[in-house]
């Protein structure tokens, strides 16, 4: 950190690395819910015109798609993954990549993916393919 | 030798406007995704603008969102920070920073350089 930029105690805006540069946030779509036309297909963009900088440092980008009886929505946010979102940990955060892996809801078709490059919720991956063969 | 020098910081009503520049030297200025940072006392770090090296492809918090507008002008060298409708807790010092280029953006990176910060204060 440059000396004339304080540290303030037990604060998590400022995260360095291991030579003390300051780490700068990601960039995440975030629209909150939204309804989405998202359906069977192997990929999907989020049509979220908002991109906002994520409040902390450590939060990855995040992307939730739930399909019920009634409609189809698409939730883009920002997320500290050592915290849960909707009660699952976001054990793929490190990704470069929005793969979509489903979760037990009852009720309703539920998938959630997180990632870690600019606007990486943009385009959410439902496709197989993804999850074994794709070096990137 | 990098530098980063801001200005354009006051004393401003609340409601009022400033606009922040921070003159850049010593680097490749279209090279380089630019931020705003900004520091409000005793606090931590808050990231409030960015815009992309070419294209002027624009990203803000929520905090600012609709009221300040980040701009560059490359033949310059130079970059902006229009702030409109300010507000008690838009007062902080305020720092333009450079980010590191790579490949693609990540969460890797980090910023490199500061400059020395210009105070805004937003009071009555």
């Known amino acids: 950190i440059p000396p004339h930029v304080q540290k303030s105690v037990n604060n998590d805006m400022i995260v360095t690395d291991n030579n003390g540069a300051v780490k700068f946030p990601q960039l995440c779509k975030f629209c909150d819910v939204r309804f989405s036309t998202c359906d069977n297909q192997k990929s999907c963009m989020s049509n979220c015109s908002i991109t906002s900088i994520c409040e902390k440092p450590q939060e990855v980008c995040v992307a939730v798609w739930r399909k019920n009886d009634e409609n189809i929505t698409l939730e883009t946010v920002c997320h500290d993954p050592k915290l849960p979102y909707h009660d699952f940990i976001l054990e793929d955060a490190a990704s470069p990549k929005c793969i979509m892996k489903e979760k037990k809801k009852p009720g309703e078709t539920f998938f959630m993916c997180s990632c870690s490059s600019d606007e990486c919720n943009d385009n959410i991956i439902f496709s197989e393919e993804y999850n074994t063969s794709n070096p990137d | 030798e990098v530098q980063l020098l801001e200005s354009g910081g006051g004393l401003v009503q609340p409601g009022g406007s400033l606009r922040l520049s921070c003159a850049a030297s010593?680097?490749?200025?279209?090279?380089?995704r630019m931020w705003w940072v900004r520091q409000a006392p005793g606090k931590g770090l808050e990231w409030v603008s960015?815009?992309?090296?070419?294209?002027?492809?624009?990203y803000y918090a929520k905090s600012v969102f609709g009221r300040f507008t980040i701009s560059r002008d490359n033949s310059k060298n130079t970059l902006y920070l229009q702030m409109n409708s300010l507000r008690a807790e838009d007062t902080a010092v305020y720092y333009c920073?450079?980010?590191?280029?790579?490949?693609?953006?990540?969460?890797?990176?980090?910023?490199?350089?500061w400059g020395q910060g210009t105070l805004v204060t937003v009071s009555s």
């Open positions: 920073a450079k980010q590191i280029p790579g490949r693609k953006w990540t969460a890797n990176s980090r910023f490199d350089y």
């Open positions: 010593g680097f490749t200025f279209t090279e380089y």
């Open positions: 960015a815009i992309e090296p070419i294209g002027n492809r624009t």
